[in-house]
Interface confidence: low
């Protein structure tokens, strides 16, 4: 397993609809044809897997049907979107990239993107 550099933004603010997008960029040491991208969430020293996708270079990312993630790839960049976020989902979202094929196998883990989620204020009752 060889190390690989992965870059991602330090901070992202989710939209009022609970959607956060960020770019995960990796420095590919060779010409990978198959790449796996995994988003991990770190909160209170606990790390959980949010979603994962595998794709062939130049093709769409394929997340599981019930995944909260979607994404597109362009070269060595992956544009990730996480949906359905609420305030309790605020945390550090880490991008993990694996170059699966051809060998050798490379693994890169980003420093994480702190995603802040603020639940929208409920609309006040109208007196009119």
């Amino acid at each position: 397993c060889k190390a690989m550099h992965v870059a991602q933004p330090a901070v992202v603010l989710a939209s009022s609809r609970g959607i956060a997008s960020f770019v995960c960029e990796y420095a590919s040491p060779g010409k990978a044809t198959e790449v796996r991208v995994t988003v991990l969430r770190q909160a209170d020293s606990q790390v959980t897997e949010v979603c994962a996708a595998t794709y062939m270079m130049g093709n769409e990312l394929t997340f599981l049907d019930d995944s909260i993630c979607t994404g597109t790839s362009s070269g060595n960049q992956v544009n990730l979107t996480i949906q359905g976020l609420r305030a309790m989902d605020t945390g550090l979202y880490i991008c993990k990239v694996e170059l699966m094929y051809p060998p050798p196998y490379y693994l890169g883990i980003g420093n994480g993107t702190q995603i802040y989620v603020i639940d929208p204020e409920p609309c006040p009752d109208s007196d009119f």
């Epitope: 897997e49 994962a52 595998t54 794709y55 062939m56 769409e60 394929t62 599981l64 699966m100 094929y101």
Partner: antibody
């Protein structure tokens, strides 16, 4: 509805080359993300993954058998062909082909399998 | 290659029993594990993928769990049609290795 069917000789002699054909329907190997793999199972033994070919002609092989395996596809005929050289009695097994979609790393549809016996 | 081991290799159980099969990976494979059921003379049938996701059409008495190096397949209430051999398969990195199998037989 996805179906796959393996065909080829039931008996081959040691040192000969085995050629197996997987004929499928219900999907196309020209569709992005689609792959067809081969798995074998000696009598009473576990499954062994052999090879995979994808829509873009990307190929993967089991390292222990790579030097003996060739995998090709004929998109127009909906066929995948596996060849294994220098057959040995230990290669006696049921050979299966199976469908796989990129990003979902499992085989969701399998052929019925074909038993190949290697004996002189 | 990633090695998979299964326990037990043979299991004798009765209809209605709760059955648990364990699969260990020689290195961490996250949740990239599938479970298959195989009956004599038949091709394997996918039961569970991504360690815990039930394949469409598979009865809900089957469930999977685990992550990393240890995974389990559970049959909550064994039915007559469940007597078969069960295989785990890692799909984390090539080659996609299978476990040695667990045969579930009638007690």
């Amino acid at each position: 509805q996805i179906t796959l069917k393996e065909s080829g000789p039931t008996l081959v002699k040691p040192t000969q080359t085995l050629t197996l054909t997987c004929t499928f329907s219900g999907f196309s190997l020209s569709t992005s993300g689609v792959g067809v793999g081969w798995i074998r199972q000696p009598p009473g033994v576990a499954l062994e993954w052999l090879a995979l070919i994808y829509w873009n002609d990307d190929k993967r092989f089991s390292p222990s058998l790579k030097s003996r395996l060739t995998i090709t596809k004929d998109t127009s005929k909906n066929q995948v062909v596996l060849t294994m050289t220098n057959m040995d009695p230990v290669d006696t097994a049921t050979y299966y082909c199976a469908h796989r979609r990129l990003g979902l790393y499992y085989f969701d549809y399998w052929g019925q399998g074909t038993l190949v016996t290697v004996s002189s | 290659d990633i090695q998979l081991t299964q326990s037990p290799s043979f299991l004798s159980a009765s209809v209605g029993d709760r059955v648990t099969i364990t699969c260990w990976a020689s290195q961490g494979i996250s949740s990239y594990l599938a479970w298959y059921q195989q009956k004599p003379g038949k091709a394997p049938k996918l039961l569970i993928y991504a360690a815990s996701t039930l394949q469409s059409g598979v009865p809900s008495r089957f469930s999977g769990s685990g992550s990393g190096t240890e995974f389990t397949l559970t049959i909550s209430s064994l039915q007559p049609e469940d007597f078969a051999t069960y295989y785990c398969q890692q799909v984390h990195i090539y080659p996609f290795t299978f476990g040695p199998g667990t045969k579930v037989d009638i007690k």
